[in-house]
């Protein structure tokens, strides 16, 4: 409507006596500027004047006057939006309604706000969810319809009289819409707060208090349970009886089932608040509780541990580890229910006791072969001893023992016989599933554990063999002392240390390698003749026709063995000369004459010196001396040298005789 | 209505045997209850005697002093539990009350509350 | 055996008077303790089991407390009808360690 001027303000205000009241108030004139402004209290409209009357609390005017209720009065606005009020302090008989009288150039307003002031500081309002649960937060908020600058207030929780721990969030407002005080509270409820009493206390600023307002708790919770049991211990033996008491000390709402529940699995038929165990067993042994429900949930006890004692059950023995391999450690574990846990125990091995063996663990440190067969043990408890079980096998594995090697052959084995040869031993776990032999060779395993060796070596010495399952055990290595005949006999020259001159003294030995048996004979041959049987061949003073083709043999009782044949060559210096003339000693002149120096020498004739009758050397130095034509004057005796790298050798004198020709006899 | 009721001689004479009976009205003997005897001497206190099982097992508990000389026995069929004490003395002069117990026993030992009580006879031994 | 043992032998007190009454057993019972109220010439009245519960029909100004071995009956505002003896009793047993029923030695409330 165009023609109303517009105000916002709370519709009611609320204060009590001696407080303030602020009153938060905008406005729009309909035209300019206000230019006067009228607090009245409870104002009535004189239709008489067109005037209100009424007590004035306030007035301002174009000429200034101020009443003297001014100064507790206070129009905190301006000339064209605010209309802020306040009133400080405020009294019991300011209740009922303000009258705020505007007027601007042309136009005029009365605008009614309500004041309710009450002799006493008026209570705040708790407000709580509409159901409050355990453990879920809730908010609870205390409302006070008041808030003013000149007047300070605080709201404190309280709960049982106690302040409340919790930090409260105060927050005020002072706003055209509204004027308030609240207090708000997280807090989250334990069924134990069900039924207690919650208050907020308004208070002023040195924390006197004002007024309150107080709510009672109801938190509602699932059943709060107290499980009694006899005996209190919990602690029975077979055949014994048990009564377990369930007492609901809060439940809100009421309960409306109760149920008995062990090791969290409901019991069947068990519906009242006392379960009866009679003649217990020792599989009723375990956690029991009560579960009681409303409609938040069920509530369940604490758990009681019932333990129904009994003598040990036959015993079962666990090994840590089987198979256990020897000289490893393996540990026995007398495992038996029994309730109290068995205090003393008997340990047995193949059905004899253990001596000293008390402890419900065995340990053997260092596991032999022996320690392999059957485990047992019987627990004892104060009710009594248990009964032996069946046992457990210890199964001690190890590598094969005295493992041998052994030669099948008659003695001696020679070279070239076949030799078969097993491995045993006497003793393995596991089972043996392969051998291996060293040395390693191209032989037959004709089955499991036999070596056939085919045309043995002179040099098979020594053989081993291991027998293997999970590991390998080798035996010694047996020696196969083959026997063969002597081997790599050769000729070798111990002396001279340099080449043979004639007339050295000479040594040849025979060699050989080896031999076995050991014992050997010797025989030296030249050309197919026999010339010692000796190791070595001697020559005191060895001639050139010495030189030749010698071969030595060794033999033994297995065989014998030749050396390849050895060439024995003599030096000397050239012997045997002679001059020998082709074609012969007469010769025609005129014809050809040769004369060849012939010699035995070793090594051969390196150079030849030719000789006349008168000693004199002649100027040829081959073997053959080439007359031609000869002359009578070639007639005579000639000789020869041949010379080598040992000596010197002379020919006897071979006399040329050069006859006439016809021709020249027919001159003559 | 659920009651007990004692009866005996009243007068024994010493070495003799004594013998009381408990008729128990209203309670079902198969349910979770003993049936037990407490004596009181006259002017002294409250002395625990023996308990039995009614129900089919008739498990007896006796406090440790009472083993031997007293006997509890039932009959299911009456609802009825007896008292046997051989070799009185003077010293057995008492008030025996019968009562309803709710517990638990085993191995000889029992323990249970006494809810119901009757209201006791007064055996007297003198010559 | 368990021996209970209760004090005092003899309580002087006055109506309204709050009453205390203890009883110490020589084992560990939990909370399996039961108190009786006897008039002269009467049968034992039950009042509580397992140390706390009051037994039915039983006034609210009667409560027990306590377990193990210390245990407590209160009176809280003593009535005339509560003048009488007051007997524990362990209702505890074990087989285990050899124990059962046992009543204390009495406990006589009397007019001061």
């Known amino acids: 409507d165009s023609s109303k001027w517009v105000f916002e303000h709370p519709e009611t205000l609320y204060a009590w006596e001696g407080a303030c009241v602020w009153i938060p108030c905008t406005y729009r004139a309909l035209d300019g500027d206000l230019e006067s402004f009228i607090l009245f209290h409870n104002p009535e409209y004189n239709k008489n004047t067109s005037k209100f009357d009424g007590t004035r609390l306030y007035e301002s005017t174009k000429d200034g006057k101020v009443p003297s209720e001014q100064k507790r009065v206070q129009f905190l606005g301006d000339k064209n939006k605010n209309c802020t009020l306040s009133i400080h302090p405020v009294h019991l008989n300011d209740s009922g309604q303000l009258g705020l009288r505007m007027e601007s150039k042309t136009e005029k307003w009365m605008e009614r706000i309500h004041l309710n002031v009450s002799e006493r500081p008026f209570p705040p309002h708790i407000q709580l969810p509409p159901e409050i649960q355990e453990s879920q937060e809730v908010t609870l908020t205390c409302l006070l319809n008041f808030s003013c600058y000149g007047y300070p207030i605080q709201l404190q929780w309280l709960l049982e009289g106690v302040p409340m721990r919790q930090a409260a969030v105060t927050s005020t407002s002072l706003t055209i819409k509204s004027v308030f005080t609240r207090s708000e509270l997280k807090f989250s409820p334990q069924w134990s707060h069900h039924g207690k009493i919650v208050t907020c206390q308004l208070q002023d600023a040195d924390g006197k208090f004002l007024s309150n307002d107080t709510v009672q708790l109801n938190v509602k919770h699932t059943p709060k349970l107290e499980i009694k049991v006899t005996p209190s211990d919990a602690i029975v033996r077979e055949g014994d009886s048990v009564t377990m008491t369930c007492e609901v000390s809060s439940s809100n709402p009421e309960y409306t089932t109760v149920s008995w529940l062990k090791d969290g699995t409901s019991l069947k038929k068990q519906n009242t608040f006392t379960l009866n165990l009679r003649e217990v067993t020792k599989d009723q042994s375990g956690k029991y509780c009560c579960q009681v429900s409303n409609d938040v949930g069920p509530g369940r006890s604490e758990e009681v541990f019932l333990q129904v004692q009994y003598a040990p059950e036959p015993s079962t023995v666990q090994i840590l580890h089987s198979p256990a391999v020897e000289g490893s450690q393996v540990e026995f574990l007398c495992m038996s229910l029994a309730n109290p846990l068995p205090t003393n125990y008997t340990w047995y091995h193949n059905g004899k006791e253990m001596q000293g063996r008390t402890e419900e663990k065995v340990h053997i440190p260092k596991i032999l072969p022996w320690h392999a067969g059957t485990y047992s043990c019987v627990a004892e408890n104060i009710l009594g001893t248990g009964q032996r079980g069946p046992g457990a096998e210890l199964d001690v594995q190890y590598p094969p023992k005295k493992v041998t090697t052994v030669i099948q052959n008659p003695m001696p084995i020679r070279e070239g016989d076949t030799v078969t040869l097993s491995c045993n031993y006497n003793s393995s776990n596991p089972s043996v599933t392969r051998y291996e032999w060293k040395p390693h060779g191209a032989w037959e395993e004709p089955s499991l554990g036999v070596l056939k060796i085919q045309n043995v070596g002179w040099d098979n010495t020594t053989i081993a063999c291991a027998a293997c399952n999970s590991w390998c055990s080798w035996a010694s290595p047996v020696a196969l002392n083959v026997q063969y005949a002597p081997r790599d006999v050769r000729v070798r020259k111990i002396k001279p240390l340099s080449e043979i001159h004639s007339g050295n003294s000479v040594s040849l030995q025979c060699d050989f390698s080896s031999s076995h048996p050991k014992e050997v004979q010797f025989f030296w041959e030249k050309n197919g003749r026999l010339l010692g049987k000796e190791s070595q061949l001697n020559f005191d003073s060895i001639s050139p026709e010495d030189a030749g083709s010698y071969s030595c043999w060794v033999n033994n009782s297995i065989g014998q063995t030749a050396s390849k044949a050895w060439t024995l060559e003599v030096l000397y210096a050239p012997r045997r000369l002679r001059v020998s003339m082709s074609p012969g000693d007469q010769v025609m002149e005129g014809k050809s004459a040769t004369l060849t120096c012939e010699s035995d020498a070793n090594p051969p004739v390196s150079h030849y010196t030719w000789f006349d009758w008168n000693n004199q050397s002649l100027p040829y130095h081959s073997q053959k001396l080439r007359l031609e034509p000869v002359k009578v004057q070639h007639s005579g005796a000639y000789w020869c040298q041949g010379t080598n790298s040992v000596g010197k050798g002379r020919s006897p004198l071979s006399t040329l005789t050069v006859y006439y020709s016809p021709e020249t006899i027919g001159r003559r | 209505e659920v009651q007990l009721q004692e009866s005996g001689p009243g007068l024994v004479k010493p070495s003799g045997t004594l013998s009381l009976t408990c008729a128990a009205s209203?309670?079902?003997?198969?349910?979770?209850?003993?049936m037990c005897w407490v004596r009181q001497p006259p002017g002294k206190g409250l002395e625990w005697v023996a308990c039995?099982?009614?129900?089919?097992?008739?498990?007896?508990y006796y406090a440790t002093w009472a083993k031997g000389r007293f006997t509890i026995s039932k009959d299911s069929s009456k609802t009825q539990v007896s008292l046997k004490l051989s070799s009185v003395t003077a010293a057995d002069t008492a008030v025996y009350y019968c009562?309803?117990?709710?517990?638990?026993?085993?191995?000889?030992?029992?323990?249970?509350?006494?809810?119901?009580w009757g209201q006791g006879t007064l055996v007297t031994v003198s010559s | 055996d368990i021996v209970m043992t209760q004090s005092p032998s003899t309580l002087s007190a006055s109506v309204g008077d709050r009453v205390t009454i203890t009883c110490q057993a020589s084992?560990?019972?939990?909370?399996?303790l039961a108190w009786y109220q006897q008039k002269p010439g009467k049968a034992p009245k039950l009042l509580i089991y397992?140390?706390?519960t009051l037994a039915s029909g039983v006034p609210s100004r009667f409560s027990g407390s306590g377990s193990g071995t210390q245990f407590t009956l209160t009176i809280s505002s003593l009535q005339p009808d509560d003048f009488a003896t007051y007997y524990c009793?362990?209702?505890?047993?074990?087989?285990?360690?050899?124990?059962?029923?046992?009543f204390g030695g009495g406990t006589k409330v009397e007019i001061k």
């Open positions: 209203g309670i079902d003997f198969s349910s979770y209850y003993y």
């Open positions: 397992y140390a706390s």
């Open positions: 009793q362990s209702h505890d047993y074990s087989s285990v360690r050899s124990y059962g029923n046992a």
């Open positions: 084992q560990n019972i939990g909370s399996g």
């Open positions: 039995i099982d009614p129900a089919s097992s008739g498990t007896t």
């Open positions: 009562a309803r117990a709710y517990g638990s026993g085993g191995s000889g030992y029992i323990g249970c509350y006494f809810d119901l």
